[in-house]
């Protein structure tokens, strides 16, 4: 499955929107830094494209879920959030088309299922952190920074997959 060129443009726009969403000086939030344990190994180059697409899809779906909550709506600018949702939704559509193309071709590798589970647990840790921090502005900024980093790493994987073709 070939992801359209617009997909990587959408990824860049998503990162730009995340950057624009910032609301407070980050320097006041240093002590709120947290190790969320991003499962970087699940986005390593050892994966075949067919195995990677569902993991990337899960990643973007979880980002969508995280920023779709009422707590998120209270934390961020509504206009930017709407643009953010639109970009994520388009990327999910692109990836879903690839997932559907791949159905029935091979058995779902156990490794892929483990990777999806690792991504879900990662987002559970993020959600728990926000809850423990009572959804404070700094907690949201730490999470935004973390999502920018993890999204960027997963985007780099998409680019490396495209360049290998």
């Amino acid at each position: 499955c070939d992801l359209p060129q617009t997909h990587s443009l959408g990824s860049r726009r998503t990162l730009m929107l995340l950057a624009q969403m910032r609301r407070i000086s980050l320097f006041s939030c240093l002590k709120d830094r947290h190790d969320f344990g991003f499962p970087q190994e699940e986005f390593g180059n050892q994966f075949q494209k067919a195995e990677t697409i569902p993991v990337l899809h899960e990643m973007i779906q979880q980002i969508f879920n995280l920023f779709s909550t009422k707590d998120s709506s209270a934390a961020w600018d509504e206009t930017l959030l709407d643009k953010f949702y639109t970009e994520l939704y388009q990327q999910l559509n692109d990836l879903e088309a690839c997932v559907i193309q791949g159905v029935g071709v091979t058995e779902t590798p156990l490794m892929k299922e483990d990777s999806i589970l690792a991504v879900r647990k990662y987002f559970q840790r993020i959600t728990l952190y926000l809850k423990e921090k009572k959804y404070s502005p700094c907690a949201w900024e730490v999470v935004r920074a973390e999502i920018m980093r993890s999204f960027s790493l997963s985007t780099n994987l998409q680019e490396s997959l495209r360049s290998k073709e």
Epitope: A19, R22, S25, L26, F27, C29, L30, K31, D32, R33, H34, D35, F36, E141, V142, A145, E146, M148, R149, S152
Partner: antibody, heavy 121, light 107 residues
Framework: EVQLVQSGAEVKKPGESLKISCKGS????????IGWVRQMPGKGLEWMGI????????AYSPSFQGQVTISADKSISTAYLQWSSLKASDTAMYYC??????????????WGQGTLVTVSS | DIQMTQSPSSLSASVGDRVTITCRAS??????LNWYQQKPGKAPKLLIY???SLQSGVPSRFSGSGSGTDFTLTISSLQPEDFATYYC?????????FGQGTKVEIK
């Protein structure tokens, strides 16, 4: 390869102004903060301040607030440290280093080679 | 401001020795503590971050431990290239602060 390259050594007179630079390459410049550290001859490390190049937000150590200005030009991936009126006590080696911001990642993992500033009449 | 106090300020040791440097923060900083090595005329080099994580490319003879206010840098078997000055630095809150340094010299 990640690199921070600083401008060359400077010899200045008291009262003169100066702007030294730190150019980042091999990484996304706006994804990391840039910190400045002073080391006076034979002394330890002193943190001066930091900048977020994505929007030029800055934070200073109280010891350096008002004494120096930190700025950045993200279009050329460069951070700056400047003085409007140098004093003999500003004689030191100045280092820039990158910081991961709010991410749980190594702090000051890459450093510039240092810029030696000598202020003497 | 958070004060960082290193001890000792200097020490003499031989190649193969186990060396321990301690750093104390004036208030709890969790695990937000870094260790750097600096050789004369060179920029500092990150060894340990977040109290115990070994920076990529740093030999495994270097290790860090501690949390809260008390931290330790250990060199399990001192090598000739380890003779340098070591600094701790808190990254918990601004202003960031360094310890005064520990100079490791040849006995």
């Amino acid at each position: 390869e990640v690199q921070l390259v600083q401008s060359g050594a400077e010899v200045k007179k008291p009262g003169e102004s100066l702007k030294i630079s730190c150019k980042g390459s091999g990484y996304s410049f706006t994804s990391y903060w840039i910190g400045w550290v002073r080391q006076m001859p034979g002394k330890g490390l002193e943190w001066m301040g930091i900048i977020d190049p994505s929007d030029s937000d800055t934070a200073y150590s109280p010891s350096f607030q008002g004494q120096v200005t930190i700025s950045a030009d993200k279009s050329i991936s460069t951070a700056y440290l400047q003085w409007s009126s140098l004093k003999a006590s500003d004689t030191a080696m100045y280092y820039c280093a990158r910081h991961p911001g709010l991410n749980w990642a190594p702090d000051f993992d890459y450093w510039g080679q240092g810029t030696l500033v000598t202020v003497s009449s | 401001d958070i004060q960082m106090t290193q001890s000792p300020s200097s020490l003499s040791a031989s190649v193969g020795d186990r060396v321990t440097i301690t750093c104390r923060a004036s208030q709890s900083i969790g695990k937000s503590l870094n260790w750097y090595q600096q050789k004369p005329g060179k920029a500092p080099k990150l060894l340990i971050y977040f109290a115990s994580s070994l920076q990529s490319g740093v030999p495994s003879r270097f290790s860090g431990s501690g949390s809260g206010t008390d931290f330790t840098l250990t060199i399990s078997s001192l090598q000739p290239e380890d003779f340098a000055t070591y600094y701790c630095q808190q990254s918990y809150d601004f202003p960031l602060t360094f310890g005064q340094g520990t100079k490791v010299e040849i006995k």
